[in-house]
């Protein structure tokens, strides 16, 4: 004969207001013959939740026909939860007995606490772009969650990261409770196409966490390298002279050439490529008039990137014809 | 088999005493109760009292009250009632009845019954 | 006391019939009725309980409704073997208590 286990398997039992919570209760024996009754809480003030064989309880139905011989599910639903509703249930086997019926054994109890589910994180990135090698700082928020356990994550591409600090407030007992976390990430020149990603893990999400997500290039200024090239054949009394910029982002940037430090108008053409890593390249060709009579042309390509301090790399021409060294030079 | 097992027919004298046994096999005694129910002839169902086989707690008819003893012996599971100070009214058959209901009481083992007479 | 009354206190039936015994409880006693069938010389033996639960290994021609003060017991067509006393039981309380019986015979 087996002895009778009252088997109430959630330890915890998060609701939501309004919804329906079903506490489940399983016995592994019908003997001895009896009822089995649900409390909240326990000793002489234990409120009766449900007994099937008299009283009224409109929002709790059982899960099973609780008049079938064999029926060992005596599971329990209670309908439209309110505040009011939580504590500690337990089922309690009963024998007969007389002129009452006697306590068996109870179940181990099942804690009903309310639940709610935390927000879509929100991550926000630094206010200013950086360039790489340095660091900057993400923070993420989520709100409105309980119980006040919760497990926040951060992710580089995929990667974890650990260099961040969390706080959720409020420290105390609360109806609802907020998560704020601040990552410090590290930028490298390719994190244009980079993401960071704030994962939230909280019980009421049924192991299906919550993420918030910024992009990278949203923070990143990678600027750009120049280089000033003169093309070896000439056209007449012209030399074609381009300058390349490349990878820098973001996409803003203004260009300006001069002449013996006299600025140009005019500009050939120029092309705007983009990299696989999200940066870009910009190419400007200048077509500058020379006359063998004139002995030294400087031209300055100056590049004005995402609002910063002008960057600029000259080229001395070179209008010999049977000269082939080019000399050039930068200036910040 | 699950089953109840009653004791033989008994006649006897109006005063006298009367102890009918009911042994169950089959199952977990002491797990259910086990109720006694007499049928006086051409009559219907007259329950007497119920007693738990499991703390030998008893419940009996207001009307038999202080004639009648119910026990139980779980070493042999078997359960007895005894019915005092016969009267020619208390002629029947008398059944034992396994009572089997959760909330409830309903019985769904009897035995046999024991026929007892009484007569001067 | 529970007092439960039983109608008709007989009927005469024919074999493929539906016959239709219904029970009165006093006072409410919500699905705890029983109903049983029993045969001259014979022990009770349980048709139905908690009103409508039909026990194990009785025929699903026997059924049972109701509940509160008012029960109901059908064989939805009589067989041969069916020719008995029935007898309702609430087990809602102590003292249990059994309505007085109805005798189907053959008509």
């Known amino acids: 004969e087996e002895e009778l286990q009252m088997i109430q398997p959630e330890k915890l039992l998060l609701v939501t207001v309004g919804k329906t919570a079903t506490l489940h209760c399983t016995v592994t024996s019908l003997l001895p013959v009896g009822p089995v009754l649900w409390f909240r809480g326990v000793g002489p003030g234990r409120e009766l939740i449900y007994n099937q064989k008299e009283g009224h309880f409109p929002r709790v139905t059982t899960v099973s026909d609780l008049t079938k011989r064999n029926n060992m599910d005596f599971s329990i639903r209670i309908s439209s939860i309110t505040p009011a509703d939580v504590g500690t249930y337990y089922c309690v086997k009963f024998r007969k007995g007389s002129p009452e019926n006697v306590e068996f054994k109870s179940g181990p109890g099942t804690e009903m606490a309310l639940g709610a589910k935390p927000s879509a994180p929100v991550v926000l990135g630094p206010a200013a772009r950086t360039t790489p090698e340095h660091t900057v700082s993400f923070t993420c928020e989520s709100h409105g969650f309980s119980p006040r356990d919760i497990t926040l994550k951060w992710f580089k591409n995929g990667n974890e990261l650990s260099d961040f600090q969390t706080n959720v407030d409020p420290t105390g007992q609360s109806v609802a409770y907020s998560i704020r976390s601040t990552a410090r990430v590290v930028l490298d020149p390719w994190d244009v196409r980079s993401q960071v990603i704030c994962e939230v893990a909280h019980v009421t999400l049924q192991g299906d966490p919550l993420r918030g997500t910024a992009n990278l290039s949203e923070a990143i200024r990678v600027p750009p390298t120049l280089e000033v090239t003169q093309q070896p054949m000439r056209v007449g009394n012209q030399v074609n002279v381009t300058c390349q910029v490349r990878k820098f982002y973001p996409q803003s940037l203004q260009l300006t050439w001069s002449e013996n430090g006299n600025v140009c108008q005019r500009e050939t053409a120029s092309t705007l490529t983009e990299n696989k890593d999200g940066t870009y390249n910009w190419t400007s060709w200048f077509l500058v008039n020379i006359s063998d009579q004139r002995d030294d042309v400087v031209l300055t390509c100056q590049v004005k990137h995402d609002g910063q301090l002008a960057v600029s790399k000259r080229l001395a021409l070179e209008v010999t014809v049977h000269q082939k060294d080019q000399s050039s030079d930068a200036t910040p | 088999q699950v089953q109840l097992v009653q004791s033989g027919a008994e006649v006897k004298k109006p005063g006298a005493s009367v102890k009918v046994s009911c042994k169950a096999s089959?199952?977990?005694?002491?797990?259910?109760?086990i109720s006694w129910v007499r049928q006086a002839p051409g009559q219907g169902l007259e329950w007497m009292g119920w007693?738990?086989?499991?703390?030998?707690?008893?419940n009996y008819a207001q009307k038999l009250q202080g004639r009648v003893t119910m026990t139980t012996d779980t070493s042999t599971s078997t359960a007895y009632m005894e019915l005092r100070s016969l009267r020619s009214d208390d002629t029947a058959v008398y059944y034992c009845?396994?009572?089997?209901?959760?909330?409830?009481?309903?019985?769904?083992?009897w035995g046999r019954g024991t026929l007892v007479t009484v007569s001067s | 006391d529970i007092q439960m009354t039983q109608s008709p206190s007989s009927v005469s039936a024919s074999v493929g019939d539906r016959v239709t015994i219904t029970c009165r409880a006093s006072?409410?006693?919500?699905?705890?009725l029983a109903w049983y069938q029993q045969k001259p010389g014979k022990a009770p033996k349980l048709l139905i309980y908690?009103?409508?639960n039909l026990q194990s290994g009785v025929p699903s021609r026997f059924s049972g409704s109701g509940s509160g003060t008012d029960f109901t017991l059908t064989i939805s067509s009589l067989q041969p073997e069916d020719f008995a006393t029935y007898y309702c039981?609430?087990?809602?309380?102590?003292?249990?208590?059994f309505g007085g019986g109805t005798k189907v015979e053959i008509k």
């Open positions: 089959g199952y977990t005694f002491h797990g259910y109760g």
């Open positions: 039981q609430q087990g809602a309380s102590f003292p249990i208590t």
């Open positions: 006072q409410g006693i919500s699905s705890w």
């Open positions: 007693i738990s086989a499991y703390s030998g707690e008893t």
């Open positions: 009845a396994r009572e089997a209901g959760s909330s409830w009481y309903d019985f769904d083992l």
């Open positions: 908690a009103a409508s």
